[in-house]
Every structure is written in structure tokens, then in C-alpha cells.
């Protein structure tokens, strides 16, 4: 049986059940390399409390559809001698990066995971030439996820004192120059994740090979190497390589750009101080507030919730967007869709799409940016579920009793962007984390 998601095959992936202190290792095409789980385990559960390992999915007992992968085992899941067997179930959804498997829940018999990934899309529009896993768990099982830094088009310019060259990088994947053919990037070779531009020429100085690594609690490392054997004439016979170290700052701060810290014979060392390198619980909440010692800030957007069936309305030329954030009030136009953001076509108001659902909510405060994300909306033709990204700005003099109002700013591949000036986005900072 052919591997259903070949892009995901090259790596053993990890997911965590934080509630029960359990680390899962997942290899969807072969078996995980963990002796204690046996030679054919595709999903290996490592119980960190008891230091034991249990195979909860066998690679030989795999069954697959386009959006679901199941691994059975021969292990009875209760002691009553019934026919039920322990199994793992991975539901795949279209995403814009390789993404990460997320532990959802587990019953006595089934361990459930969900994975938003380019590998599950109906079209190849989000697929990279080369992409590697972009997250890592530290020794405390806290997740550090750089997926939000991945650029689907364009690249980051590295801060460098050399006026004759410009170094451009992407995070965990190659630079897509076709979708955003900026003048400098146009000459970058396909597959490069680190592109050195000198005058009118561009050179591949690194491609992603291995996934993100954690070196210390707040330092993550990504290494790129040039795969082709051909040496570049300005590298003194050395093969180019790029090392990017992502550093979680010791306290809350605005974002910075990646900085070149060392360069020798085409070996480039880059340091990037960014809160995306911090653990995810420091940055994100599933509710509309972020507070407490863990986050170093106090943010509460719940006063923006609308009651009594009213919604915020944002004009998007062809469409009207109805928004009801931080609550579970149905938007009348989007009846029964559980939408937090509802897209209605002006010329045909029967064409209604959920552009993100209220139970699929993430509030994120990172590098000084406050963002509310609603995902899991109605599918687009690519298979990607519509989502909305609301970027908040602090405005102490916002109208509408300080609440302000959302403004639609554009759409890219079924992701809808809004800005929202409001006094409730004014962040109160605490001390250190």
C-alpha cells in the first residue's frame, strides 16, 4: 500500500498529551525507531511519569482514506476479552505548511490526533519544494512552534553590514519566488531557503534538510546546507551552510529582524530574537484573554463580544463580513454554521460562507503583535478551510465606546485579514517570565 502523504514520510513527528504527561512519536509511512515499542510501531506512546512505552498503532495494520489514517494494534484495550483493540486515528485537514500533529483526546481504545498540513490539500498551491518540521518540544514537553514565521511567498532580509550582498532566508522551507517575484528574489534558485544576492546574481547557500532542534530551553536551531556538489567560487572551496538560532527573549518585547552574527567561507550564522521561539503557552490562548504569570501580560478582548444577535460589519468590496468575536452567539446570516466570521456575497446574499468558527479560536500575542485567529471555516476549492486573522492595534480613543470596529484589509488563499483599532487591545505588561 502506497504511503498516503509522502511529504510527511521523511520524519518521525511528535505530539504531546500535556494532561497526562505523555509524548507520542508518529511515523506515518514506516515505523518509529524506538525499541521498546517494537519493530513495527507507527505510533509509540512514551509515558514520562512511569518511563514506559506502549505501541498504540502498528504500521502493518494501517488503513487510509484521503483525510483519515488509522493504525490498529493487536492489543486488547480492556481486560474483558472483547474484540476491541487499541488504535490511533489521525484526521488530516488542509493547511498552508507541513504543520504539526496535535493530540486531541484519547478514549480507552482510541488515541485521536488532528493534523493541518499541505499534504492533505486537494491542490498543490501550498506545497513547498522542500520543507522540514518547524516545531519542537522541550524537556518540559512545552511546544515551541515556528510555523507562524514560515513565509508562503517572499523572504526575510537578514540584517548584515555588508553593502555588496543581501542574504534572504525563509523559515523551515524554501523561498517561493513565483508567488511573490520581488525584483531581488527573482533570480534565487528553486529550492533555496537561504539566498545570497550579489548585484544581479543570486546563489543558493542553503536548503532545509533537518527539522528544528532545541539546544536549550529558549534557543532553537535550524540548519540549512547547499545540497548541490558544485562549489561557489567565492567560498574558498567550502560548502555553504546557514545556521539560524532563534532566541526567546527574557522579557516581552517588540519583534526584531534576523541578524547575521558571523560569516566565514560561506558559513553564515544568524541570530533571531523572537517570541515565536518561546513556548506556545506563553504566546497563545484558546480564550479571548491572555493573563497570568505565565504570559507576562494582561489582555482581555471579551468586552468586544456582541450580544443580542448584533454583529460587527466589515465591507470587503464584493463581500460583507459579519463578525462576532469572543463569544458563541450565532451570526444570523450564518445560521447554524457556528461562525465567528461570516462572509456574505453582496450580489447574492444566499452565498454565505463561514470564514472561521467560534470554537476554533486562537488569541496570540507575539513580538508585539496581538492577533485573534478563527479557523475551521467552510472549505475552499483547495480543501483549505477558510480562516480569518484579526490584527489588533491599541487605540485609547477608539469610537463605539472604545470598542472600535474591524476593517477588512484583504484575502490571500482563503485567509481573510482584518485590522481592528480598539482600547481593549492596549496591553498591560508584567515583569519577567
Amino acid at each position: 500500500q502506497a504511503a498516503p502523504f509522502p511529504e510527511l514520510c521523511s520524519y518521525t513527528w511528535e505530539a504531546v498529551d500535556t494532561k497526562n504527561n505523555v509524548l507520542y512519536k508518529i511515523n506515518i509511512c514506516g515505523s518509529v525507531d524506538i525499541v521498546q515499542c517494537g519493530p513495527s510501531s507507527a505510533v509509540c506512546m512514551h509515558d514520562l511519569d512511569t518511563r514506559t512505552y506502549h505501541s498504540v498503532g502498528d504500521s502493518v495494520l494501517r488503513s487510509a482514506t484521503r483525510s483519515l489514517l488509522e493504525f490498529n494494534t493487536t492489543v486488547s484495550c480492556d481486560q474483558q476479552g472483547t474484540n476491541h483493540r487499541v488504535q490511533s486515528s489521525i484526521a488530516f485537514l488542509c493547511g498552508k505548511t507541513l504543520g504539526t500533529p496535535e493530540f486531541v483526546t484519547a478514549t480507552e481504545c482510541v488515541h485521536y490526533f488532528e493534523w493541518r498540513t499541505t499534504a492533505a490539500c486537494k491542490k498543490d498551491i501550498f506545497k513547498a519544494n522542500k520543507e522540514v518540521p518547524c516545531y519542537v518540544f522541550d524537556e518540559e514537553l512545552r511546544k515551541h512552534d515556528l510555523n507562524p514565521l514560515i513565509k508562503l511567498s517572499g523572504a526575510y532580509l537578514v540584517d548584515d553590514s555588508d553593502p555588496d550582498t543581501s542574504l534572504f532566508i525563509n523559515v523551515c522551507r524554501d523561498i517561493d519566488t513565483l508567488r511573490d517575484p520581488g525584483s531581488q528574489l527573482r533570480a534565487c534558485p528553486p529550492g533555496t531557503a537561504a539566498c545570497l544576492v550579489r548585484g544581479h546574481q543570486a546563489f543558493d547557500v542553503g536548503q532545509p534538510r533537518d527539522g528544528l532542534k532545541v539546544v536549550r530551553k529558549d534557543r532553537l536551531v535550524l540548519s540549512y546546507v547547499r545540497e548541490e556538489a558544485g562549489k561557489l567560487d567565492f567560498c574558498d572551496g567550502h560548502s555553504p551552510a546557514v545556521t539560524i538560532t532563534f532566541v526567546c527573549p527574557s522579557e516581552r518585547r517588540e519583534g526584531t529582524i534576523p541578524k547575521l552574527t558571523a560569516k566565514s567561507n560561506c558559513r553564515y550564522e544568524i541570530e533571531w530574537i523572537t517570541e515565536y521561539a518561546c513556548h506556545r503557552d506563553y504566546l497563545e490562548s484558546k480564550t479571548c484573554s491572555l493573563s497570568g504569570e505565565q504570559q507576562d501580560v494582561s489582555i482581555d478582548l471579551t468586552p468586544l463580544a456582541q450580544s443580542g444577535g448584533s454583529s460587527y460589519i466589515s465591507d470587503g468590496k464584493e463581500y460583507l463580513f459579519y463578525l462576532n468575536v469572543c463569544g458563541e452567539t450565532e451570526i444570523q446570516f450564518c445560521n447554524k454554521k457556528q461562525a465567528a466570521v461570516c462572509q456574505v456575497k453582496k450580489s447574492d446574499t444566499s452565498q454565505v460562507k463561514a470564514a472561521g468558527r467560534y470554537h476554533n479560536q486562537t488569541l496570540r500575542y507575539s513580538d508585539g503583535d496581538l492577533t485573534l485567529i478563527y479557523f475551521g471555516g467552510d472549505e475552499c476549492s483547495s480543501g483549505f478551510q477558510r480562516m480569518s486573522v484579526i490584527n489588533f492595534e491599541c487605540n485609547k480613543t477608539a469610537g463605539n465606546d472604545g470598542k472600535g470596529t474591524p476593517v477588512f484589509t484583504g484575502e490571500v488563499d482563503c485567509t481573510y485579514f482584518f485590522t481592528w483599532d480598539t482600547e481593549y487591545a492596549c496591553v498591560h505588561h508584567h515583569h519577567h517570565h
Partner: nanobody, 116 residues
């Protein structure tokens, strides 16, 4: 005050059965992962069984097929049903509760002796 109290231990003949109970107070019981451990005289404490907050169960190889862990959330109690007991099961049995927001909580233990 957070507490765990084991009961149900005693003297039993080889091949016999016992049911241990562990009653919890002061915690949201259903949110916690529950484990049974045991410590035989002169030996280190060893893990016996786990009942995760979601419901999955795992057992040490030495008790698999003989012991069953279960819980009753209405009574805030976790049980360990022990069948086909052997002399090597003789130990003090402890229950443990754990969750991301709590330090591990241990009970005082209950003695199980398997002897003819």
C-alpha cells in the same frame, strides 16, 4: 486539603482476588491521571497501572491480564481489581494522582499479602 486514601488490602491466598480502593478529596478528580504503584519489602517502588484522565489504561507486564484499573468519578474513587494473585504481588500498594496544575499526590498505602 488534597488527600488520597487507599483501602481494601489484606491477606489473601495465592490465586485469590482483592479490590483496592483509592478515595480522593480536595481535587477535581476527573481531571487527574491516576496511577497505582507498589513497593515490596527491600525493593524499590514500582509502577503497576495507569488510568489517564481521558480513560486509556496501561499495565505493567507483570500484572497484565490479571489486574484491572477503573474509576468512579461520582465517588471520586479509583479501583484496582487484582485477580490470580501470586506471592510476588505481596507489597504495599499506593495510589497517585497527577495533573498539569498539581504536584503529584500520593496516598499512605495499603498492605497486600499473598500467602498460603
Amino acid at each position: 486539603q488534597v488527600q488520597l486514601q487507599e483501602s481494601g488490602g489484606g491477606l489473601v491466598q495465592p490465586g485469590g482476588s482483592l479490590r483496592l480502593s483509592c478515595a480522593a478529596s480536595g481535587i477535581i478528580f476527573s481531571d487527574n491521571r491516576m496511577d497505582w504503584y507498589r513497593q515490596a519489602p527491600g525493593k524499590q517502588r514500582e509502577w503497576v497501572a495507569t488510568l489517564a484522565s481521558y480513560g486509556w489504561k496501561t499495565y505493567a507486564d507483570s500484572v497484565k491480564g490479571r489486574f484491572t484499573i477503573s474509576r468512579d468519578n461520582t465517588k471520586n474513587t479509583v479501583y484496582l481489581r487484582m485477580n490470580s494473585l501470586k506471592p510476588e504481588d505481596t507489597a504495599v500498594y499506593y495510589c497517585k494522582a497527577s495533573s498539569p496544575v498539581l504536584n503529584d499526590i500520593w496516598g499512605q498505602g495499603t498492605q497486600v499479602t499473598v500467602s498460603s
